[in-house]
């Protein structure tokens, strides 16, 4: 019965972009402005997504298919399709509730989102320091002795703490 | 010793899709950020794309967000790039390229480099 | 247009000493760290340099690379035939998200 009433449902001709419309015996009608129906024989459009706000439209909205939006400039996206914008913190800060704050000692972050995360420990894989960490990047490890070969960098010692931010050139 | 395989490319018309596959061997894959760069014929290296394995984190350039959708699998060490929609200007050869340091204990593989190199494989875009 | 200038092409006789340099920003250079890939004509991006100034076991010392603020450099001594290939500094950009190579120079020995 199932079969039989789809093959014969009118509704099922309607294209991607209309929509079957029971007001005017079924015939397809085009999708009113600002909406979209992205698979055929819909009996409705759905309404485009709008990007207001702290949204902006990547995407615009076509008969076929919804808008898609990103987040203005100083801010990121989170969420499936971009559902919440987030504020951009700088290279070395994580978001916190009163905003940016600058990574402590021994943390970095080396993106505009994120938290702070805590330095690369080398000696876990037996390895040792070859370039210190700021709040901005992360420390570098250097091959164990053991690893190291001709032409290959030689280990260098670490070198006293620095103040954070500051980077070893 | 780090092997790269990339597959999957060919000749696709404008607004088409390919899903390109890279097949890696010769190191633990599960614990090293990968990255899909391309160079269009004559022109330099881009850089299209990144994944994590420890968080599943994915970035991609400007130019092909929102289009291209990169993928791994841990269990079949194999990377993937789903690129939807494409443009004459996606033409190129696309390289799978590894990074160095190992996470989880590597907190961040930028300082590391891409160390590992697959041989490319070439994407037409024509009508 | 890359974020990161580097020339276009640099030449050199067998045994000079040639820099090729890369220009960036606070965003990428200035706080991050740089990589420098050779790449021989038809074959792929080998990592050169990484972490700004080190050497990948294997990669003759002869190559050496440096960074001062926002700029880096790579250079290349004693010169050989084999050193002909096109060079790319990279870094990561925190604004963009993502990573970035400079256009890449294209070195000539003569």
């Known amino acids: 019965f199932e079969r039989t009433r789809s093959l014969q449902d009118p509704c099922s001709n309607c294209p991607a972009g209309t929509f079957c419309d029971n007001n005017r015996n079924q015939i397809c009608s085009p999708c009113p402005p600002n909406s979209f129906s992205s698979a055929g024989g819909q009996r409705t459009c759905d309404i485009c997504r709008q990007c207001k706000g702290v949204f902006r439209t990547r995407k615009e909205c076509s008969s076929t298919s919804n808008a898609e939006c990103d987040c203005t400039p100083g801010f990121h996206c989170l969420g499936a399709g971009c559902s919440m914008c987030e504020q951009d913190c700088k290279q070395g800060q994580e978001l916190t509730k009163k905003g940016c704050k600058d990574c402590c000692f021994g943390t970095f972050n080396d993106q505009k989102r994120g938290i702070c995360r805590p330095w690369t420990n080398c000696s876990l894989d037996g390895k040792s320091v070859l370039v210190n960490g700021t709040k901005e990047r992360d420390v570098v490890c250097g091959p164990s002795p053991a690893d190291l070969s001709p032409g290959a960098s030689s280990v260098t010692p670490p070198a006293p703490a620095r103040e954070p931010g500051h980077s070893p050139q | 010793e780090v092997q790269l395989l990339e597959s999957g490319g060919g000749l696709v018309q404008p607004g088409g899709s390919l899903r390109l596959s890279c097949a890696a061997s010769?190191?633990?894959?599960?614990?090293?950020?990968m990255s899909w760069v391309r160079q269009a014929p004559g022109k330099g290296l881009e850089w299209v794309s990144v994944i994590y394995p420890d968080d599943g984190n994915t970035y991609y350039a400007d130019s092909v967000k929102g289009r291209f959708t990169i993928s791994r699998d841990n269990s079949k060490n194999t990377l993937y790039l789903q690129m939807n929609s494409l443009r004459a200007e996606d033409a190129a050869v696309y390289y799978c390229a590894k990074h160095g340091g190992q996470k989880p204990t590597t907190k961040s593989s930028s300082a590391y480099g891409m160390d590992g190199w697959g041989q490319g494989t070439l994407v037409t875009v024509s009508s | 247009q890359s974020v990161l200038t580097q020339p276009p092409s640099a030449s050199g006789t067998p045994g000079q000493r040639v820099t090729i340099s890369c220009s960036g920003s606070s965003s990428n250079i200035g706080n991050n760290y740089v990589t420098w890939y050779q790449q021989l004509p038809g074959t792929a991006p080998k990592l050169l340099i990484y972490?700004?100034?080190h050497r990948p076991s294997g990669v003759p010392d002869r190559f050496s690379g440096s960074k001062s603020g926002t700029s880096a450099s790579l250079a290349i001594s004693g010169l050989r035939s084999e050193d002909e290939a096109d060079y790319y500094c990279a870094t990561w950009d925190y604004s963009l998200s993502g990573y970035v190579f400079g256009c890449g120079t294209k070195l000539t020995v003569l």
């Open positions: 972490a700004d100034s």
């Open positions: 010769g190191f633990t894959f599960s614990g090293y950020d």
